[in-house]
Amino acid sequence: SGTTNTVAAYNLTWKSTNFKTILEWEPKPVNQVYTVQISTKSGDWKSKCFYTTDTECDLTDEIVKDVKQTYLARVFSYPAGNVESTGSAGEPLYENSPEFTPYLETNLGQPTIQSFEQVGTKVNVTVEDERTLVRRNNTFLSLRDVFGKDLIYTLYYWKSSSSGKKTAKTNTNEFLIDVDKGENYCFSVQAVIPSRTVNRKSTDSPVECMGQEKGEFRE
């Protein structure tokens, strides 16, 4: 058979951040190519990344159709130049991925502090509401649109002159915190989905400090 040198894909791994979702696998192909199929538990298989020599396939377009569904992918291996060839059982070699539920498993991307504005002894800190590739009515949804109040942000803030941190939470994208007048503060935020058991937290945002350009001060 022409498949004697064909090996099945292995280490199939979902890499997903803010719903941008790529399936990766091994090995790097030698005299073989791959095709990926994806389906929901109850749906039909859809083929993607036909006869590719890559070891990754962007499946974002498929999973964003319904991020609460559970998906399964499989990677088929074919001999290069003979993609019609089948394995000894009469079908090409393939390997299944783990199941993947985007809503529950996509990693939360590093958030960004959009702005902060001081009015007297209050500071309003706004977190950028990142756009995702999830669509509804032909418009792209933001992270907040998708997760609603399932998504919270934790703010860390501290006086530039000291190391003692404070924290606050919000289930919107805004914090209103009390500060000491005349003091400069630094801010960092983290996204969290409390109801999750995996991939619950993002990495911290870059630190932004008062006295730099993102801020605004009003008496």
Partner: antibody, heavy 117, light 107 residues
Framework: EVQLVESGGGLVQPGGSLRLSCAAS????????MHWVRQAPGKGLEWVGW????????IYDPKFQDRFTISADTSKNTAYLQMNSLRAEDTAVYYC??????????WGQGTLVTVSS | DIQMTQSPSSLSASVGDRVTITCKAS??????LSWYQQKPGKAPKLLIY???GLADGVPSRFSGSGSGTDFTLTISSLQPEDFATYYC?????????FGQGTKVEIK
């Protein structure tokens, strides 16, 4: 099964130090925030502080900031509370708790710290 | 810092009674409040979190309501195993603060 087990409590003299441990099992501490809460005999609950074990961020009640230090070792899946310059009024049961960011869902059984000469 | 004023500090009630405990925050904490039950010699146990949810394994006779500054824990029909001390906790901003506790005793 999620479990938190505190250890390291005991009798210590005023001015002394103690390090409490909170060993976690059934989950990875880096995925959660970990807190220390204490309760003096016959009194209510008092929050001490938290750590995000993934990045080391710590937050304290200001009254403990100078004497207490929270740390974590993710390889050991354990959080710690280092207490220095202990006073009689630090006598309490010390609990660690897991925080989902919405609630403290699991607590350890507590470890008693007695500060007395 | 946010102060949490819990009332009453203690109450006596009979099995089957409806019991209400309140917590008042010194300023708006939105919905960042949870309720805990503690029995003597034991660790606190999560009962209620917000926006109101019953913790796993907690009987439906427990319920929570409120947002902003005023919060209520209700036990619709007190059972023998409910005699304990109850605490609210605000975790919207640091330092996190507990209410002083409400001891529910047998009348």
């Amino acid at each position: 099964e999620v479990q938190l087990v505190e250890s390291g409590g005991g009798l210590v003299q005023p001015g002394g130090s103690l390090r409490l441990s909170c060993a976690a099992s059934g989950f990875n501490i880096k995925d959660y925030y970990m807190h220390w809460v204490r309760q003096a005999p016959g009194k209510g609950l008092e929050w001490v502080g938290w750590i995000d074990p993934e990045n080391g961020n710590t937050i304290y009640d200001p009254k403990f900031q100078d004497r207490f230090t929270i740390s974590a070792d993710t390889s050991k899946n354990t959080a710690y509370l280092q207490m220095n310059s202990l006073r009689a009024e630090d006598t309490a049961v010390y609990y660690c708790a897991r925080d989902t960011a919405a609630y403290f869902d699991y607590w350890g059984q507590g470890t008693l710290v007695t500060v007395s000469s | 810092d946010i102060q949490m004023t819990q009332s009453p500090s203690s109450l006596s009630a009979s099995v089957g009674d409806r019991v209400t405990i309140t917590c008042k925050a010194s300023r708006d904490i939105k919905s960042y409040l949870s309720w805990y039950q503690q029995k003597p010699g034991k660790a606190p146990k999560l009962l209620i979190y917000y926006e109101p949810g019953l913790a796993d394994g907690v009987p439906s006779r427990f319920s929570g309501s409120g947002s902003g500054t005023d919060f209520t824990l209700t036990i619709s029909s007190l059972q023998p195993e409910d005699f304990a001390t109850y605490y609210c906790l605000q975790h919207g901003e640091s330092p996190f603060t507990f209410g002083q506790g409400t001891k529910v005793e047998i009348k």
